[in-house]
């Protein structure tokens, strides 16, 4: 028997779009934009499980849905890769893999996933619930990292299947069928808006949810575009080192910590929705980290799909050696 | 561009202990191990250990453990490799390297003899 | 410990013409689930420090020339040199990548015939 901690981060969607919108038609251009906008938004997902021949031993598993190629991973416990994280293995896809204890295994599952198991005896193993932390570097979406651990083991409800297969035939599905989809959803906003340059916009109403919906952002991913991409997974986290995660950023800047609800992932639905807010904190969470390579010069404009952002202190660091940016 | 930067030669007793430095320049002195490879004259190379800086984790060479000790210091970013007990089989070039052996320190001669 | 067996211990070959040296490891190499052969190799001249030349069994690294070239899988690798300079006589090493400790060939001495 396993204990995991998985759950799907979608949701139904929300109520009251329709009416934000004015009219059922406007809604479809606005998915299409977000759809071909956020096409390429790669996510990060983690499983953490103990196993329960050995209470002691954790299985830690990591996988990158995106398109791009994996030029290195780094797995952290007690916080993110670089804020406060302890690095227990580094896997690069061909020069090999570092691991250092507890790490007992670390390998390549398959070509964009990897585990990694821990001993746990003595003063350097986990405790149940302690954060590990998976980053991605990747070209060219750049470095994505997500943190997760282990649920409290009394909570009956956080039971996920066996093999977070769905993981990985939702990324295959993504990279095949999106393709298409897109095309054709991109040609057919552009005839929906050519369409509508010759006639008056409708006036919208103003959104109840959001203030601020003037300042919607485009890049904004929206619940379909996640729901027609891929399903990623976020994993429930209840650390026993808050102060790890009250730390993991301390140079402010774009870093939201959007604490998500347990049986789901909040994500901006519609324009009214998409103004940055807070969720309120409910002792779980999810991250992705969206850090340039160094040659870039600079952060991108927006911080992946809409989930906690760990920016690096170091700034966007790049990897040595010639598959990373020097 | 990632460089490494070793001491000098050393001439040392047998009994006595060795430490070697490696000064890194270039890339996140923290990111990746340093590794340390020694080669007996005309003999092959040989791992020893490695360590981690940004937590000092380390990894030996079995046969090592016990008489070699990897240290790091970020501050200065430099990594140490200190070799106890030296014997006169012990003379080799020292080197440390990084990034899975992708760059590598010029190597320090060390010489164990009475 | 993987054990890493080069052969030949020393070769000889003309300029231009191909040279070939096999690696052999006690263990596969192979991980199995992104189907990469963990496998590095090595050139070490005269009093420098040795120089990676390709990882993966196959990916050269940055800046070494494309006369080299990496194959093989599992337990079986070979490093060729498809056409030899002058500046190529040097001593080859493979080294497994693949598991705790790292291990390395007893080197193959390349001189020109």
């Known amino acids: 028997m396993r204990t995991e901690a998985q759950v799907p981060a979608l949701q139904p969607p929300e109520p009251g779009l329709e009416g934000a919108m004015g009219h059922r038609t406007l809604v479809l251009p606005w998915v299409l934009l977000t759809l071909c906008v956020t096409a390429g938004t790669p996510e990060v997902w983690v499983q953490v499980r103990m196993e329960a021949t050995e209470l002691s031993s954790f299985t830690i598993r990591c996988g990158f849905l995106g398109s791009g190629s994996i030029s290195l991973v780094t797995v952290s416990w007690g916080g993110p890769n670089g804020a406060g994280g302890t690095t227990l293995a580094v896997l690069h896809p061909e020069r090999g893999i570092r691991q250092w204890a507890p790490a007992r295994q670390a390998r390549w599952e398959t070509q964009s996933s990897i585990s990694l198991i821990l001993e746990g005896s003595g003063a350097s193993s986990p405790c149940a619930n302690t954060t590990f932390c998976c980053k991605f570097a990747s070209f060219p979406e750049g470095s994505w990292e997500a943190c997760g651990s282990l649920p409290p083991s009394s909570d009956p409800g956080l039971s996920a299947p066996p093999t977070p297969a769905p993981i990985l035939r939702a990324d295959l599905a993504g990279i095949l069928g999106v393709s298409g989809v897109l095309l054709f959803g991109c040609v057919y906003l552009l005839h929906l808006l050519r369409r509508h340059k010759h006639r008056p916009a409708p006036r919208l109403q103003p959104s109840r949810t959001s203030p601020q919906a003037p300042r919607a952002r485009a890049w904004a991913p929206s619940q379909a575009s996640q729901a027609a991409l891929h399903v990623p997974y976020a994993t429930i986290n209840t650390s026993c080192r808050p102060a790890t995660l009250d730390t993991a950023h301390p140079h402010g800047g774009p870093s939201w910590w959007a604490s998500l609800p347990t049986h789901a992932a909040h994500r901006p639905q519609g324009p009214a929705a998409w103004a940055s807010t807070p969720i309120p904190a409910r002792g779980s969470f999810v991250s992705v980290e969206n850090g340039l390579y160094a040659q870039a010069g600079e952060r991108p404009p927006h911080t992946g799909p809409g989930l906690t952002l760990f920016p690096d202190p170091r700034g966007p660091r790049a990897m040595e050696g010639p598959l990373g940016v020097r | 561009e990632v460089q490494l930067v070793q001491s000098g030669a050393e001439v040392k007793k047998p009994g006595s202990s060795v430490k070697v430095s490696c000064k890194a320049s270039?890339?996140?002195?923290?990111?990746?191990?340093i590794e340390w490879v020694r080669q007996a004259p005309g003999q092959g190379l040989e791992w020893m250990g490695e360590?981690?800086?940004?937590?000092?984790?380390?990894n030996y060479n079995e046969k090592f453990k016990g008489r070699v000790t990897i240290t790091a210091d970020e501050s200065t970013s430099t990594a140490y490799m200190e070799l106890s007990s030296l014997r006169s089989e012990d003379t080799a070039v020292y080197y440390c390297?990084?990034?899975?052996?992708?760059?590598w320190g010029q190597g320090t001669l060390v010489t164990v003899s009475s | 410990d993987i054990v890493m067996t080069q052969s030949p211990d020393s070769l000889a070959v003309s300029l231009g013409e191909r040279a070939t040296i096999n690696c052999k490891s006690s263990q596969s190499l192979l991980n199995s689930g992104n189907q990469k052969n963990y496998l590095a190799w090595y050139q070490q001249k005269p009093g420098q420090p040795p120089k990676l030349l390709i990882y993966g069994a196959s990916t050269r690294e940055s800046g070494v020339p494309d006369r080299f070239s990496g194959s093989g899988s599992g337990t079986d690798f070979t490093l060729t040199i498809s056409s030899l300079q002058a500046e190529d006589v040097a001593v080859y090493y493979c080294?497994?990548?693949?598991?705790?400790?790292?291990?390395f060939g007893q080197g193959t001495k390349l001189e020109i015939k």
């Open positions: 080294q497994n990548a693949h598991s705790y400790p790292p291990t």
């Open positions: 360590i981690l800086p940004g937590s000092n984790s380390t």
């Open positions: 270039g890339g996140t002195f923290s990111s990746f191990s």
């Open positions: 390297a990084r990034y899975w052996f992708a760059y």
